[in-house]
């Protein structure tokens, strides 16, 4: 069964191509209510009435998933838990189409990076998606940020069109994904 969320698309617009955020400085673990204040509005089909969507308000729909671009800063682990609070997971990129969609969204925020659901325990162990599935570098390459001072960047974020490894403790924004079934 598919949950249908009804929302007024009039408020689900982008301003100057940037995601709106009323809570950019909330660095603490968000509550359910504060999460709703710290996410980007949906880039929805522009209709004046009420539309039916398989996604909750403020989530963006693309193909068979809903996406939420969170504008609260958190570690990778904190971001993962924030997505869980909303019944979702950190982004898992399954296809080049999906990657293109995500790049288009985050490229409108060139100053920001977004955690995705890829991590590893340490450099000797392969990258793993949050759901336990294997990572294939056929889809994208992960550009390393490792230095002698920071030798263990074991989480992954996307910045504009490039995907980097990064220290998991660095506060960043994040992308939650909720798959739906018709």
């Amino acid at each position: 069964t598919m949950a249908i969320w009804r929302s007024n698309s009039g408020s689900n617009t982008l301003e100057n191509g940037y995601f709106l955020s009323r809570n950019k400085e909330n660095h603490s673990q968000p509550t359910q209510s504060s999460l709703e204040d710290s996410v980007t509005p949906t880039k929805a089909v522009k209709t004046t009435g009420v539309l039916s969507s398989p996604c909750p308000p403020n989530w963006i729909i693309y193909e068979k998933s809903c996406y939420l671009f969170s504008m609260s800063l958190n570690s990778w682990d904190g971001s993962k838990r924030q997505c869980w609070q909303l019944g979702s997971n950190l982004l898992k990129i399954d296809s080049s189409n999906e990657l293109g969609f995500i790049v288009k969204q985050v490229s409108s925020q060139p100053d920001n990076s977004f955690w995705i659901g890829l991590s590893r325990p340490q450099t000797e162990v392969p990258w793993l998606w949050e759901d336990g599935s294997t990572f294939s570098s056929n889809l994208f390459q992960i550009r390393t940020t490792a230095t002698q001072e920071n030798p263990s960047p074991n989480c992954v974020w996307i910045h504009v069109s490039v995907i980097y490894d990064q220290l998991c403790s660095v506060p960043s924004y994040s992308i939650c994904e909720k798959k739906f079934s018709m």
Epitope: P121, Q122, E124, V125, L128, D131, G132, S133, T134, S136
Partner: antibody, heavy 118, light 107 residues
Framework: QVQLVQSGAEVKKPGASVKVSCKAS????????IHWVRQAPGQGLEWMGW????????NYAQKFQGRVTMTRDTSISTAYMELSRLRSDDTAVYYC???????????WGQGTLVTVSS | DIQMTQSPSSVSASVGDRVTITCRAS??????LAWYQQKPGKAPKLLIF???SLQSGVPSRFSGSGSGTDFTLTVSSLQPEDFATYYC?????????FGPGTKVDIE
Amino acid sequence: QVQLVQSGAEVKKPGASVKVSCKASGYTFTDYYIHWVRQAPGQGLEWMGWINPNSGDTNYAQKFQGRVTMTRDTSISTAYMELSRLRSDDTAVYYCARNSGSYSFGYWGQGTLVTVSS
Amino acid sequence: DIQMTQSPSSVSASVGDRVTITCRASQGISSWLAWYQQKPGKAPKLLIFGASSLQSGVPSRFSGSGSGTDFTLTVSSLQPEDFATYYCQQAYSFPFTFGPGTKVDIE
């Protein structure tokens, strides 16, 4: 639903080889590592290694290096674990398990008892 | 290899009891730890992954905590079906290793 079904019990002589199969269903076989874990009678769990069903890449515990071979046949969603030069202390239940979050083992086969006896 | 130790090795308890099992890694493993329950003649069952995340379908009376080298599995109110052996497993480095197990039996 996710299911892993293993081949039946085997009795082998010391020095022989055994090949255990693990047929997966209910998910995309190539998306998740398959691990092999064994348990000797009355003992704890011992990780033997894994195979990436997509690439065929393997990672074996040092203890089994040179004696174990993990393979897969993606056309029938089946993973295999072959252990050679069997000894009596290889007598154990051999499990396949599908990888889950944080490299945990979320789904397990029913186990295959391999008895090594002369 | 990372050695995993568990304590106690066995514990006798009654239905309704709160039971705590500890697991210690010989070196830091961050949160890359899982807990399993195994009953005689059965395959292990995943309870907790990532040190504290409850596997889908597992009752909420099970909880995990800890990070680094010291971890805990807690059963808040033991039920008859919880009498079993519990194992921890580290997934921080190869080879992945398990603790020796803790047997929870009826007092």
